[in-house]
Structure formats: structure tokens, C-alpha cells
């Protein structure tokens, strides 16, 4: 996160860290807890690393440097990448992770509410992006979970800023015209959440941007409301019943 500040314990209890353990262990992406056994993240996090057993999912943590060999983590039972996601495109950058064992909810580990299907009428004015990603373009992973308040921008405005890309209705953009605050490398898959009527909702999944926090280059997020049917279908068909936070 560029231009952010340290988060507090329990402030974003749905935020998880997706880490890979090969020779060493490292944080690669963020994700959002949406049910006892489900994490929502970005499909591109698994490009080149589709093997379930190399991944470790840490929930209920604030500081990555607190993780030791004894820190509990979740393992993956199943990775469900959107069927229309292609490595050659930026579309449908969404994936579900089914955990091997369900998580108990605590003050520091609980799910985020999902939006209503096709939610286009709600005007969100209080939106935040969180993650342990770089604090500048050529930076490094941060130890303490960062947060930053960023306004949504219209898709029309976003398309003007990204003429060389197709900004679809299944994407949502956020950023300041002058730049300075944004998600960055390592924040992928993490949440863009907005507070509306006293409730936090998962509006976007951190997907991509041209650099980080550049002027007139907003961050682009997968619009969760556009994938509610897919999320419900996959979580229900895998579980028999949906085990996740009901849409707001």
C-alpha cells in the first residue's frame, strides 16, 4: 500500500496473507475471508503456482514478522479460478480458495460481508484498501498491515486513464487524480472495502494498476458484485450449502 498507515488489531479481521513455502517462505498476495472455509482472492496470484500444497494462509494476523514456524496457518483444499480467466487478459481476475479446515471466528478473524448481486446503485464514499504490499513501486513487502482511504472513480473516467486497456463493467477503479495513495505489488487479491450504512462490504479485489500511486492512473479492482452468482454457485456446489457471509 502506497501512502497508507499502520492498521490496528482487529481493524480488518477478514484480511489474510497468502504465502508460498518453497525453499523460503514469502508473502505473495492478500485475500479476504468470506466464510468459515472460504477465501476470495485474485486469480493472477496463482499464475505459475497452481499447486495447493505450497500455499500457507495466515489469518488473524497484523504483523508478518510475528509469524514463526509455530504460527498456525490454513492449507488449501481447493483453488477455484474463474473459468473465463486467461493469463493473456486482465478480465475475471477472481478466485476462491476452499480451506482444508473451517476457521473459528474471533475478534481478529471474521468474514467480510459481500455486496448484493449486480450492486450498481449504491454510492460508496468511504472505501479502504489494505495489504502488506510494497509502499512504493520499487519497494518491499511491509511487516505491519497497511490501510489507505481511496475514493472510487467511475469506469468512464478510468477508461480515459487506461486507453490501452479495456475497462469492463466487471471492474471497479479507485484512486486520486494526483496519485500518492494506491495498492501496490503484494496487495493483489486483497480487499477494497467500503462502509455503507454502518456495514463494511467487499466491493473489490485488488487486481492491477499502471505502476503504483501514479498521477491519473487509478488502481483497478475486480468488482465483486458482478461475480455474486459465480461465488454462490461455487461455494454452494462445493459445500452442499453456502458457508459464507450472506450478501448485504
Amino acid at each position: 500500500i502506497v501512502g497508507g498507515t499502520n492498521s490496528s488489531w482487529g481493524e480488518w479481521p477478514w484480511q489474510v496473507s497468502l504465502q508460498v513455502k518453497l525453499t523460503a517462505q514469502r508473502h505473495l498476495c492478500g485475500g479476504s475471508l468470506i466464510g468459515h472455509q472460504w477465501v476470495l482472492t485474485a486469480a493472477h496470484c496463482f499464475d505459475g503456482l497452481p499447486l495447493q500444497d505450497v500455499w500457507r494462509i495466515y489469518s488473524g494476523i497484523l504483523n508478518l514478522s510475528d509469524i514463526t514456524k509455530d504460527t498456525p496457518f490454513s492449507q488449501i483444499k481447493e483453488i477455484i479460478i474463474h473459468q473465463n480467466y486467461k493469463v493473456s487478459e486482465g478480465n475475471h481476475d477472481i478466485a476462491l480458495i476452499k480451506l482444508q479446515a473451517p476457521l473459528n471466528y474471533t475478534e481478529f478473524q471474521k468474514p467480510i460481508c459481500l455486496p448484493s448481486k449486480g450492486d450498481t446503485s449504491t454510492i460508496y464514499t468511504n472505501c479502504w484498501v489494505t495489504g502488506w504490499g510494497f509502499s512504493k513501486e520499487k519497494g518491499e513487502i511491509q511487516n505491519i498491515l497497511q490501510k489507505v482511504n481511496i475514493p472510487l472513480v467511475t469506469n468512464e473516467e478510468c477508461q480515459k486513464r487506461y486507453q490501452d486497456y479495456k475497462i469492463t463493467q466487471r471492474m471497479v477503479c479507485a484512486g486520486y487524480k494526483e496519485g500518492g495513495k494506491d495498492a501496490c505489488k503484494g496487495d493483489s487479491g486483497g480487499p477494497l472495502v467500503c462502509k455503507h450504512n454502518g456495514m463494511w462490504r467487499l466491493v473489490g479485489i485488488t487486481s492491477w494498476g499502471e505502476g503504483c500511486a501514479r498521477r491519473e492512473q487509478p488502481g483497478v479492482y475486480t468488482k465483486v458484485a458482478e461475480y455474486m452468482d459465480w461465488i454462490l454457485e461455487k461455494t454452494q456446489s462445493s459445500d452442499g450449502k453456502a458457508q459464507m457471509q450472506s450478501p448485504a
Epitope: 493469463v87 493473456s88 490501452d164 486497456y165 493483489s188 492491477w208 499502471e210 503504483c212
Partner: antibody
């Protein structure tokens, strides 16, 4: 299956004009940046021009700027290259290519993942 | 403009040998925008590597790419008969997009 098929090449005199076409199929053409690349006989590859998915943004190599115009018709899934004021040094095989732009570590990638078979343009008197 | 310099110009190797091709750029290139292509005579180029190190669909794992900044490498671990041809690196980090002049890999 992704396919790109160029046409319109041929022999033209110096100062003449030619319009190349590239018919695309097997993918959502309107979502992709498209590009032209050329290769003079026995030489390496040279990037010529690209056009944004909507067609509203175009960029050219200095060697063709002001003489060549790239365009597209998304309703016909076709890419074009209008070549005017042709010179002997424009003689080459012209390839159209799709520019794939995936996502890696919250940035986009950029690579020419599918190419046409090429069409030969010969500029000679 | 970003100049791309490939070396060596020609590489003469036997099947089964390892090929190491270098590509140096005159300015910093974001790795996400560095690709390698293979071209055999009479054929269109074929994408091998993108993002400096990711193999394109259907490319065998004997091909690998590495590098960062201004120094990039394509390695073919064990040459197969179908690997002979010309290899190009290309950047689309900044316009004008540019290719290297190519490295020809020929049978020794």
C-alpha cells in the same frame, strides 16, 4: 482457436499506397490492443504501430509516422494498416499480432502472443 | 528510444547442448514488458517467454528466462532439432516498442 489472417500485400511503386487488412477470429477482438510488426528481407523484426482496443489511441514508429495509419473495425473484427508515400525501405513482410496483457504482481504484462502468417509488401519501380 | 542489444550474433551448438542468449537494454525495462520470440525460416515469430521469466502456453520447460533491469537472458537447457532458428528479445515498457537484432542458433 485464435487466428489472424493478413491480406492486401503486393507490389507497389515508390510513392504509392497500399492498405493491409488483418482478419481476427477466435477471441474477443474489441478487448485487445493490436499491433503491426514488419521484417525486411533477411533482416530482423521491427515494430511498426499499435492501436488501443477502442481504436482511440494509436502509436507509431518514427520510421512510418505521418505516412502510415493504423485503424480497426471492431464490428468486423478487422485491423488495418493504410500505407501512403511508400519507400523502397518499406519493403518487408508485414505481420499483425495480438498484444496479450495479462496481470503479474499487480502490474500488467505485454507480449505478442498470436501472429498472422504475414503479407509481403514490395516497393519497387 | 530503448536500444536492445543481443549477443552473440550467432551461436553454433550441437543438439543436447545448452544455449545461453543475452539481451541488454539501454535503459531500465520493467520485467513485465520483456518478451522473447523464436522464428524459424519462412515462419511467423512465436512467443516463448513473457514477463522476462514466464513461459508462454505450450512452450517446453527447457526454455527459461531470467533477468531484471537492463540485463536479460534466455536459456535453452538442452537443444532439440526444432530449436534452431533466430531468437529475438522485445520490450514494450516504453514506446517506441523495440526488438533486439536477433541471435541465430545454428547446428554445429
Amino acid at each position: 482457436e485464435v487466428q489472424l489472417l493478413e491480406s492486401g500485400g503486393g507490389l507497389v511503386q515508390p510513392g504509392g499506397s497500399l492498405r493491409l487488412s488483418c482478419a481476427a477470429s477466435g477471441f474477443t477482438f474489441s478487448h485487445y490492443l493490436m499491433t503491426w510488426v514488419r521484417q525486411a528481407p533477411g533482416k530482423g523484426l521491427e515494430w511498426v504501430s499499435y492501436i488501443s482496443p477502442s481504436g482511440g489511441h494509436t502509436i507509431y514508429a518514427d520510421s512510418v509516422k505521418g505516412r502510415f495509419t493504423i485503424s480497426r473495425d471492431n464490428s468486423k473484427n478487422t485491423l488495418y494498416l493504410q500505407m501512403n508515400s511508400l519507400r523502397a525501405e518499406d519493403t518487408a513482410v508485414y505481420y499483425c499480432a495480438r498484444v496479450a496483457r495479462g496481470i503479474a504482481a499487480r502490474s500488467r504484462t505485454s507480449q505478442f502472443d498470436y501472429w498472422g502468417q504475414g503479407t509481403l509488401v514490395t516497393v519497387s519501380s | 528510444d530503448i536500444q536492445m542489444t543481443q549477443s552473440p550474433g550467432t551461436l553454433s551448438l550441437s543438439p543436447g547442448e545448452r544455449a545461453t542468449l543475452s539481451c541488454r537494454t539501454s535503459q531500465f525495462v520493467n520485467s513485465n514488458y520483456l518478451a522473447w520470440y523464436q522464428q524459424t525460416p519462412g515462419q511467423a515469430p512465436r512467443l516463448l517467454i513473457y514477463g522476462a521469466s514466464s513461459r508462454a502456453t505450450g512452450i517446453p520447460d527447457r526454455f527459461s528466462g531470467t533477468g531484471y533491469g537492463t540485463d536479460f537472458t534466455l536459456t535453452i537447457s538442452r537443444l532439440e532439432p526444432e530449436d534452431y532458428g533466430t531468437y529475438y528479445c522485445q520490450q514494450s515498457s516504453r514506446t517506441p516498442w523495440t526488438f533486439g537484432q536477433g541471435t541465430r542458433v545454428e547446428i554445429k
